[in-house]
């Protein structure tokens, strides 16, 4: 049902990385506009992206209020130029999104190796603690602030002259690994949340190798 020439949104999909969260849907509007509402399971509906012709809506500001809550969104369809018009049941046509729990479902963004420092046969590798849009006391929290020990990093490291990738893991943002003296190594890191069953891993960081700018060597 619904008003003439108005179609309900479909394929409502959450796209979220490091808590930056956008709801996307179809179809591209023809003679219609959309408004999005979001709420927690027990909360009131809040309207966003009023009467838009876009097929996406940035809901980051809402979900970062409590990333452990479960959210539901819905997309209303209105005839263009006649947004007061309602469907045959007396209210506008709308479609519900799947439920979304940011803490469990946001994708982990690609990490970055901040630095590495060699001292003798040890190398200290530091991963950048990426800032998120989650706020506490008016400051933005880092990924580590939000996830705590739930977040680990896997370091892949290998001699420049070989292909086998050794691994190390940490629940901080630092690794201290043993290396062979006189050998150059390359590094890549991956963020992982082992307690998850889906969206557990980030993509790999860019590879950084010894003998390049980010590193420092001391005897």
């Amino acid at each position: 049902s619904g008003t003439t020439n108005t179609v309900a949104a479909y394929n409502l999909t959450w796209k979220s990385t490091n808590f930056k969260t956008i709801l996307e849907w179809e179809p591209k509007p023809v003679n219609q506009v959309y408004t999005v509402q979001i709420s927690t399971k027990s909360g009131d509906w809040k309207s966003k992206c009023f009467y838009t012709t876009d097929t996406e809506c940035d809901l980051t500001d809402e979900i970062v209020k409590d990333v452990k809550q479960t959210y539901l969104a819905r997309v209303f369809s209105y005839p263009a130029g006649n947004v007061e018009s309602t469907g045959s049941a007396g209210e506008p046509l709308y479609e519900n999104s799947p439920e979304f729990t940011p803490y469990l479902e946001t994708n982990l963004g690609q990490p970055t190796i901040q630095s590495f420092e060699q001292v003798g046969t040890k190398v200290n590798v530091t991963v950048e603690d990426e800032r998120t849009l989650v706020r506490r006391n008016n400051t933005f929290l880092s990924l580590r602030d939000v996830f705590g020990k739930d977040l680990i990093y896997t370091l892949y490291y290998w001699k420049s002259s070989s292909s086998g990738k050794k691994t190390a893991k940490t629940n901080t943002n630092e690794f201290l690994i043993d290396v062979d003296k006189g050998e150059n190594y390359c590094f890549s890191v991956q963020a992982v949340i082992p307690s998850r069953t889906v969206n557990r891993k980030s993509t790999d960081s860019p590879v950084e190798c010894m003998g390049q700018e980010k590193g420092e060597f001391r005897e």
Epitope: T167, K169, V198, R200, D204
Partner: antibody, heavy 120, light 107 residues
Framework: EVQLVESGGGLVQPGGSLRLSCAAS????????IHWVRQAPGKGLEWVGY????????YYADSVKGRFTISADTSKNTAYLQMNSLRAEDTAVYYC?????????????WGQGTLVTVSS | DIQMTQSPSSLSASVGDRVTITCRAS??????VAWYQQKPGKAPKLLIY???FLYSGVPSRFSGSRSGTDFTLTISSLQPEDFATYYC?????????FGQGTKVEIK
Amino acid sequence: EVQLVESGGGLVQPGGSLRLSCAASGFNISDYNIHWVRQAPGKGLEWVGYIDPSNGYTYYADSVKGRFTISADTSKNTAYLQMNSLRAEDTAVYYCARDDQSVSSPFDYWGQGTLVTVSS
Amino acid sequence: DIQMTQSPSSLSASVGDRVTITCRASQDVNTAVAWYQQKPGKAPKLLIYSASFLYSGVPSRFSGSRSGTDFTLTISSLQPEDFATYYCQQHYTTPPTFGQGTKVEIK
């Protein structure tokens, strides 16, 4: 339900080749690391190698380096162990196992194993 | 590579006995040690991870502890189904390595 099922074992002559498969269900292999572990008759467990299916990274035990290759097909949710230049000492039950990728990375699920016998 | 030296290689015990198996790492492995149980013809099963954490579904008579590079698996009161071979494993560095195994037999 999480399951790992190995297949492809059998009798092979020294110098021969064999490809083992590890079919996973109940989870996506690209979210985990997959290891191969073997056990010679009456002996202990020996780690063979691993693959991170999300990026193809691998590492092998010295005893198999250059002879064995681990690969994965994420569309089939399956990991493989290609064994070339087989020797009598490669005779063993071969298990695939899932690494939960926590800091201590235990192997939380194992397959039932498949027997490889290298003999003339 | 890190060596995991497990002892004893075998032991005989009776139902109800307290059993202790130890593993010594050749260098620091932090708490990255797991313990597995294996019965004849079967795959190993995870018992303990991170040195002292009981894996889901494992009976509470199993426990693990760490003192430096020494790791201990304790079965507080041996049950008939506990007669098996037990392995420690470190995964602090690649390659992960196993202890030689301890066979727990009926006295």
